[in-house]
Interface confidence: medium
């Protein structure tokens, strides 16, 4: 039985030109995470696996960071990284996990921030 | 464009070992992961295990483990399947394929394959 | 591990012909959170590698013809060949890689009359 819960930053905002944190959180079950998966729509964006360590999608090396924790850092944000983003963790015996976050990326330099993982 | 050379066939003896390699080229060696798939003649795909060429780590099919050992060399951008212990059961093509990023975990460019035949 | 089962083992059908092969997992491949179903489908000619044609259980891979259809959710896919050529004689495997490791059904093989 899946008894765990995943929180996220939920629905984030964030300046064009700027930095975010993608953020998620597996709590209540003692399954262990053996691995995560940072996707964007059709496009994985990387992995953290307990053996394999990180690995960034060569399509967004240039600009994404892994960390902090099981976190992924978006750098260099573009209008076009508007959209929904997934946290997937794998984990034994649960199965996955899914957490889902929005991230809209503002044109104004006066962008909203609510989100408690987001970079000042 | 992407190639993935494989190695030679090879006989060999019933409980030593072989090394198959896979040079990568025409891509950033460490940008994606290596798998290994083991074809025994006229049988279906199994599934190895998986080097991350970045960092050396692996995540091996439990099947596997104790039998192959996955290793990658950056500077030759080569990745390596040791095959110990042989027996008859391991005489099989063994094909590498590099990770494939669409969201998902696929095997769009293989190597042509290395037939590995274990015959006193 | 996940289970794939494929049927049936081997189908001979006359080009032209439409042909349909079934893939089911012991567990589900859908991800629930984004809709994802992690199922993929290769063709495997005699002597080669095998190709992906499909992946995300319906999604065609670039360059793959259109009469090549996946379907299906959860634990049962099917591959349909909608009208079958003489170049399609070959293996088709369905391939989990929702969870490791990644399994990889027994094949379906396509004869052509």
């Known amino acids: 039985m899946m008894t765990g819960t995943i929180e996220t930053t939920g629905n984030i905002s964030a300046e064009k030109g700027g930095s975010i944190i993608l953020q998620c959180h597996l709590s209540s079950t003692t399954a262990q995470v053996t691995q995560v998966n940072w996707e964007q729509q059709d496009q994985l964006l990387a992995i953290c696996n307990a053996d394999l360590g990180w690995h960034i999608s060569p399509s967004f090396k240039d600009r994404v960071a892994p960390g902090p924790g099981l976190g992924l850092t978006l750098q260099s944000l573009t209008v076009n990284d508007t959209g929904e983003y997934f946290c997937i963790y794998h984990t034994y015996p649960d199965g996955t996990y899914t957490g889902r976050i929005f991230l809209e990326v503002l044109e104004s330099s006066v962008a909203e921030h609510g989100a408690r993982f987001q970079i000042p | 464009q992407v190639q993935l050379q494989q190695s030679g066939a090879e006989l060999v003896r019933p409980g030593t070992s072989v090394k198959v390699s896979c040079k990568a080229s025409?891509?950033?060696?460490?940008?994606?992961?290596i798998e290994w798939v083991k074809q025994r003649p006229g049988q279906g795909l199994e599934w190895i295990g998986v080097?991350?060429?970045?960092?050396?780590?692996?995540k091996y099919n439990e099947k596997f483990k104790g039998k192959a050992t996955l290793t990658a060399d950056k500077s030759s951008s080569t990745a390596y399947m040791q095959l110990s212990s042989l027996t008859s059961d391991d005489s099989a093509v063994y094909f590498c394929?590099?990770?494939?990023?669409?969201?998902?975990?696929?095997?769009?460019?293989w190597g042509q394959g290395t037939l590995v035949t274990v015959s006193a | 591990d996940i289970v794939m089962t494929q049927s049936p083992s081997s189908l001979s059908v006359s080009a032209g012909e439409k042909v349909t092969m079934s893939c089911k997992s012991s567990?589900?491949?859908?991800?629930?959170?984004?809709?994802?179903?992690?199922l993929a489908w290769y063709q495997q000619k005699p002597g080669q590698p095998p190709k992906l044609l499909i992946y995300?259980?319906?999604t065609r891979e670039s360059g793959v013809p259109d009469r090549f259809t996946g379907s299906g959710s959860g634990t049962d896919f099917t591959l349909t060949i909608s009208s079958v050529q003489a170049e399609d004689l070959a293996v088709y495997y369905c391939q989990n890689y929702h969870s490791y490791p990644f399994t990889f059904g027994s094949g379906t093989k396509l004869e052509v009359k």
């Open positions: 080097i991350n060429p970045g960092s050396g780590g692996t």
């Open positions: 995300g259980a319906s």
């Open positions: 025409g891509y950033d060696f460490t940008d994606y992961l």
């Open positions: 394929a590099r990770y494939h990023y669409y969201g998902s975990n696929l095997f769009p460019y």
């Open positions: 567990q589900s491949l859908l991800n629930s959170g984004n809709q994802k179903n992690y």
